[in-house]
Interface confidence: low
Amino acid sequence: DSEEDEEHTIITDTELPPLKLMHSFCAFKADDGPCKAIMKRFFFNIFTRQCEEFIYGGCEGNQNRFESLEECKKMCTRDNANRIIKTTLQQEKPDFCFLEEDPGICRGYITRYFYNNQTKQCERFKYGGCLGNMNNFETLEECKNICEDGPNGFQVDNYGTQLNAVNNSLTPQSTKVPSLFEFHGPSWCLTPADRGLCRANENRFYYNSVIGKCRPFKYSGCGGNENNFTSKQECLRACKKGFIQRISKGGLIKTKRKRKKQRVKIAYEEIFVKNM
């Protein structure tokens, strides 16, 4: 129905000028990791260009995770936003550019591109369709933009990667400012329903963050993401936390989830990159 069609809508404000980062990991999405602990940590949000709180699951995740706001600011923000930090290419490139090509364990044999650190170029390879790693791009251009040398070494411009729920591909996401609402809860509750790659038709529930409800979907039996629950009750239990509305002076106020027709999707929370 139309409600589902609008699930990926991102309400945004004005665009910001291109972003240049001190460290490439500052561009990584806040990654709570696969564990289920609930720990308060900070990450640099490339969309708001600020250090913000997020919930960390206690294991894995990525380098964009700091114990304190101060540490985050020290690593990822600077006084002069226009000053280009001159560091070596090796330091500035995202870590995943240096991973080996990995076809994964499936047998889809899809043409993809990876950055070959030996030749310093993006090259074509055959991807199996599942697993693998993040050195995996749908287009040559995308691979070049993220991993090859630019004129001034690597700089992150409109950098953000979004995991495509259908084929686990990485697609670029333009740098936008999120709306006034953000979801305060496990980040997988904001990911779209993902059937996965197999052929079963299991009845499952996922949390639809647009409407704030748990909805049924058909799961293929393998793969997919963590927004996948065997019962509606389990889904609500994991994802029932409300939205948080930002107020002008940086404070946060809890707001109820019942906003029937309000389409709110948070750009930075939608970026869902699989753990390497």
Epitope: P34, I38, M39, I55, C222, T230, A238
Partner: antibody, heavy 117, light 111 residues
Framework: DVQLQESGPDLVKPSQSLSLTCTVT?????????WHWIRQFPGNKVEWMAY???????RYNPSLKSRISITRDTSKNQFFLQLNSVTTEDSATYYC??????????WGQGTLVTVSA | DIVLTQSPGSLAVSLGQRATISCKAS??????????MNWYQQRPGQPPKLLIY???NLESGIPVRFSGSGSGTDFTLNIHPVEEEDVATYYC?????????FGGGTKLEIK
């Protein structure tokens, strides 16, 4: 219903490797949750050892990280524990379990492993 | 690591009376209004069985004579009235931080 069953040797010699298998029935280990090894020493102390997440990612107790490995065979719906360089201190009942959100909801019956020359 | 200290190590309670088991954490296991403390029962020769999750939630199928309370670093498991089948060792377990840790156990016996 979900069931887990541990299997492996009852006796292992010191310095050798301990290999255990957990066979899961009633739920696919690639469909969800995380799948764990937990051990209970004589005297009842319980220690979480490692898990393999349904996505394939793994996590180990830092106290064991240098000598532990957890893997899986998705075609058989099994996951495995390998503990290297065992000593008599590793004698314990080894359980496999499933973690649902923040608690362990299913456990195997456990297998007693004795490390002795 | 978060260390969990259970007390007493063992206790003997008359049938129909109340058993109270304490679990103290070396640091808070609370976050955002939730307490990430679970309780398990282990009967002799059996694996642990979940009784209470997140401090006070009774697991499905567990009798209402079991209850959990507490927050921060101090948690309590109550059994009232105690029945013969409750003879077991009880463990607390925190899931706020990895590695997940268990208490040393409290052995419940009938007087």
């Amino acid at each position: 219903d979900v069931q887990l069953q541990e299997s492996g040797p009852d006796l292992v010699k010191p310095s050798q490797s301990l290999s255990l298998t957990c066979t899961v029935t009633g739920y696919s280990i690639t469909s969800g949750y995380s799948w764990h090894w937990i051990r209970q020493f004589p005297g009842n102390k319980v220690e979480w050892m490692a898990y393999i997440h349904y996505s394939g990612s793994t996590r180990y107790n830092p106290s064991l990280k240098s000598r532990i490995s957890i893997t899986r065979d998705t075609s058989k719906n099994q996951f495995f524990l390998q503990l290297n360089s065992v000593t008599t201190e590793d004698s314990a009942t080894y359980y496999c379990g499933r973690r649902a959100w923040t608690w362990f909801d299913y456990w195997g019956q456990g297998t007693l492993v004795t490390v002795s020359a | 690591d978060i260390v969990l200290t259970q007390s007493p190590g063992s206790l003997a309670v008359s049938l129909g009376q109340r058993a109270t088991i304490s679990c103290k954490a070396s640091q808070s296991v609370d976050y955002d209004g939730n307490s990430f403390m679970n309780w398990y029962q282990q009967r002799p020769g059996q694996p642990p069985k979940l009784l209470i999750y997140e401090a006070s939630n009774l697991e499905s199928g567990i009798p209402v004579r079991f209850s959990g309370s507490g927050s921060g670093t101090d948690f309590t498991l109550n059994i009232h009235p105690v029945e013969e089948e409750d003879v077991a060792t009880y463990y607390c377990q925190q899931s706020k931080e990895d590695p997940w840790t268990f208490g040393g156990g409290t052995k419940l016996e009938i007087k």
